[in-house]
Interface confidence: low
């Protein structure tokens, strides 16, 4: 059968499963004269044979783990044994079967974890190897916790990353682990090949001993410090402690106070450095930070609360040098005249600020003493004995003692006896007509003057007039100020006028006295006036519904995908045209009519996220006014960056000759987002031919060790290719090269004769 199993001499590749006894030939090569026989060379390992007539076969089972690819050459010879065709490469790829079990690198692991460590943060890695092909399920390892001892309430405190073997705390473990209750745990971990998915997978187990260490980095209890302390300062008030010696402590004042009266020493003891004043500040909240020797925070800051305790260090104070009240003639007994409200700066609702009021003197004592009384705790003055007559005594002066538990203060009250309030205010006009204003009239403008008069005693509460707008201005756009000498009212604009919501307002004013009217007298129509405010339109710019619009898309969205939209409205109802400003990367376009935003180019989170542009809304027609808002596009990460070396590793060297196998450590990174747990790269040699000389082993998710397998290296540079896989979705792989020089050394450095100084390696192993 020409074609599948026979044919002319040409480069060919065959795939054969390992571990299977030969059951058929590989290929029958046909000779073209003058060729008469065939010869096989290369990596035959005494397994591959070609008969003189061109029949290529193998004589025993292959082992991929011994050699994954056999590079053979076949040549055609003439009758004299001279090559007349070829040699051509024949590649035998050995396909993997699951004939190796995974094995843990250690039969027992030991680790420690601090209580309250962050859940999901690895504190220990277990590592197993399987000689089968990692690109197939045969070599894909799956880690599992078989048992946790002890197991409390059936709750797992530990978890393992099935792929990487990283052991971390669960949320429950972070919250509940307590070395005082249980200082150590044992985990039995299994590893299975076939990705853990097959009944026929091989497995291995290992034991992990975990010590739980106490986390003493805890916020101390809130501190209470008495104000105005006379003890020598600084005074230790509390302390924090990092878990290990050598931390550098500092305090952070989040409030940025002009005077920050606290300090911390290098033991973590916290001091108050000067007396505190509760009346200046009654509580402090600040943070204690622990940093390592490089100034990097070791953990989250701790919140320190200091409450300043009050002492009675403030006397009562009067509201003003003299407090003036008015009382109408003929007011009835018990009527309230007014309330004296003294103050005390000490802590509210405590004995230190609880005030008592007492009248200590009344002058004149006409027609008798004791005309007034004051409520002991409320400070309210009342008429005690009889109605007053202005013609007898127009004014009384009271001295009132106000006291807290330690201090007394005298306050003075003047009580003016005034005419009875039997006259109502009367507007000079009942209708102030129409007023037309543009909607952009300035706030604070006086737009109208109104006037009412009151025939009661001048310059008393009976004749003083207060104006209120009682109708037509529910938004509170207008207000009325009164001139106390003339009782003239000035109507002013307090909030912007708005044609769109209130083009016409029918305003009603009421004029009234601060003093109550005497019994039987009521306000009537004379105390009311009206006024009509007409607001004219001013063309205004469109208004966006938000100051900032935000949208979130994956960085790999197809070109033309809608990524967001913005909306604006024109107060006058005109149509709006949308445009973009500041699209520096040329990634976006906006639909002028709808405000929908689309991608017009490939997006890239690594170039910067969020991507910020401005959106402009412009009136169509009218005066083309416009306004601007922000559009922020948050780009979500896609695994689109292959791993690479974290830094430049030129200059790695070993001193030649090697006295023992050596190793070096390198670090990988990639530009994708690695939330919480960081990258988890896997490392392997970049080509099979390197495996005799080199070995690569993973240290953690970002670092690996490259080791020599022997000491027989030439004195030259070797370029070691390393394959780094990021295990992402989809997984991306980078092949990087580590140049390693073997060189003669003088005092631990590469020796180069004068004139050969270029490219001297700088890192010795």
């Amino acid at each position: 059968q020409e074609g599948k199993f026979s044919g002319p001499l040409k480069p060919m590749t065959f795939s054969i499963y390992e571990g299977q006894e030969p059951s058929q030939i590989i290929f029958q090569f046909k000779a073209n004269p003058p060729a008469v026989t065939f010869e096989l060379t290369g990596e035959t390992d005494n397994i591959f044979v070609i008969e003189r007539e061109g029949l290529l076969y193998y004589n025993r089972a292959l082992d991929r783990e011994t050699r994954s690819t056999h590079n053979l050459q076949v040549a055609a010879l003439d009758a004299n044994g001279i090559i007349v065709e070829g040699p051509v490469p024949i590649t035998i790829k050995v396909k993997d079967i699951n004939d190796n079990r995974p094995t843990f690198l250690q039969s027992k692991y030991e680790g420690s974890v601090r209580q309250n460590s962050r859940p999901g943060k690895p504190f220990l890695y277990v590592n197993a190897t399987d000689l089968d092909d990692p690109a197939t399920p045969n070599g894909q390892l799956y880690y599992q916790i078989v048992i946790q001892l002890p197991m409390i309430n059936n709750v797992m405190y530990f978890q393992i990353n099935n792929k990487t073997g990283a052991i971390s705390l669960t949320r429950e473990g972070s919250q509940e682990l307590n070395p005082a209750k249980n200082p150590s745990y044992n985990l039995v971990i299994s590893v299975k090949d076939m990705g853990g998915q097959s009944e026929n997978s091989f497995s291995d187990t290992t034991s992990v001993d975990i010590i739980v260490t106490e986390n003493i980095w805890k916020a101390p209890k809130p501190v209470e410090m008495v104000e105005n302390s006379t003890d020598p300062h600084p005074i230790k008030i509390t302390q924090v402690r990092w878990n290990d010696p050598g931390a550098q402590y500092s305090l952070v004042d989040k409030e940025k106070l002009p005077r920050f009266p606290f300090s911390i020493d290098q033991e973590g003891d916290i001091y108050v450095t000067q007396p505190l004043d509760r009346e200046e500040k009654d509580a402090y909240v600040f943070y204690a930070v622990a940093k390592d020797e490089y100034g990097k925070p070791l953990s989250y800051p701790l919140e320190i609360h200091v409450k300043v305790k009050d002492i009675n260090d403030n006397p009562p104070t009067c509201p003003s040098p003299v407090t003036v009240f008015e009382v109408q003639e003929n007011e009835r007994l018990g009527n309230s005249i007014g309330t004296l409200t003294a103050h005390d700066r000490d802590e509210e609702n405590t004995a230190n600020s609880f005030l008592n009021y007492r009248i200590v003197e009344q002058t004149p004592k006409l027609p008798m003493d004791g005309l007034f009384l004051i409520q002991t705790y409320a400070g309210m003055l009342q008429l005690a004995k009889q109605s007053l007559k202005k013609q007898d005594t127009p004014q009384y002066n009271l001295t009132i003692e106000v006291s807290d538990k330690d201090f007394k203060t005298l306050c003075f009250v003047q009580i003016n006896v005034i005419d009875i309030n039997d006259q109502i205010p009367i507007f000079e006009k009942s209708d102030y007509g129409n007023l037309t204003l543009a909607e952009d009239t300035n706030i604070g403008s006086t737009i109208l003057t109104i006037q009412a008069t009151d025939a009661d005693e001048p310059f008393t509460g009976s004749s003083k007039i207060l104006y209120h707008i009682i109708k037509g201005d529910s938004e509170g756009r207008l207000g009325v100020d009164t001139d106390p000498h003339t009782n003239t009212g000035y109507v002013i604009i307090k909030k912007p006028l708005d044609f769109e919501t209130a083009a016409v307002s029918n305003i009603v004013f009421k004029a009234e006295n601060p003093e109550p009217l005497v019994f039987g007298v009521k306000y009537n129509a004379s105390s009311f006036a009206k006024f009509t405010l007409i607001v004219t339109d001013v063309n205004e710019a469109p208004q966006f519904s938000q100051h900032v619009f935000q949208a979130k898309v994956s960085e790999d969205v197809a070109i033309g995908t809608k990524v967001g939209n913005v909306t604006a409205k024109d107060p006058e109802g005109l149509d709006i045209s949308y445009s973009l400003r500041g699209d520096t990367r040329g990634w976006l376009k906006i639909d002028h009519v709808t405000g929908e935003i689309f991608s017009v180019a490939p997006l890239d989170r690594e170039a910067g996220s969020p991507y910020r542009v401005q959106v402009v809304a412009t009136e169509v027609g009218g005066s083309s006014l416009s306004s601007v808002s922000e559009f922020h596009l948050i780009l979500m990460d896609v695994n689109d960056n292959p791993p690479r070396l974290a830094k430049d590793y030129t200059g790695l060297f070993f001193c030649h000759p090697l006295s023992a196998p050596g190793s070096l450590i390198f670090e990988a990174t990639d530009d994708d987002q690695h939330l919480f747990r960081g990258p988890h790269f896997t490392f392997s040699l970049g080509s099979g031919s390197l495996q005799n000389d080199w070995e690569v082993s993973k240290i953690n998710g970002t670092h690996a060790r490259l080791s020599t397998r022997h000491t027989e290296f030439e004195e030259r540079e070797y370029v070691v290719l390393i394959r780094i896989n990021d295990g992402g979705r989809p997984p991306l792989e980078g092949i990087v090269s580590l140049p390693v020089t073997f060189c003669s050394c003088v005092e631990g450095s590469c020796f180069r004769p004068a004139g050969h100084q270029t490219g001297i390696p700088t890192v010795g192993m």
């Epitope: 030991e110 200082p183 010590i211 260490t213 878990n243 290990d244």
Partner: nanobody
């Protein structure tokens, strides 16, 4: 409360022998890696000998062949047998459980080797 109490230090002639003991309480002793560290005046604390919970041992180069670390899990005690002592072995010797970075420390015992 965790406590590590060292004993067995003292003054000895060069070439002599001492056996240090460290009794532990308050910890699950058999689960801890145990170590002896020392600190001479003006120097940093350095590891002398270490033994993992599995029984693997390691020693500082300067004491290899002369010092031996051992442990008795039943008695919650770790030992350091010091033979052929030299003047440069003079230091305060500290017992440690759980490692220098995260573990627990004893108060230390003085070892003085005179020439």
């Amino acid at each position: 409360e965790v406590q590590l109490v060292e004993s067995g230090g003292g003054l000895v002639q060069a070439g002599g022998t001492l056996r240090l003991s460290c009794a532990a309480s308050g910890i699950r002793f058999s689960f801890y890696a145990l170590g002896w560290y020392r600190q001479a005046p003006g120097n940093q604390r350095e590891l002398v000998a270490n033994m993992t919970s599995g029984g693997s041992t390691s020693y500082a180069d300067s004491v290899k062949g002369r010092f031996t670390i051992s442990r008795d899990n039943a008695k919650n005690t770790v030992f350091l047998q010091m033979n052929n002592l030299k003047p440069e072995d003079t230091a305060v010797y500290y017992c440690n459980a759980g490692g220098a970075r995260l573990g627990y420390w004893g108060q230390g015992t003085q070892v003085t080797v005179s020439s």
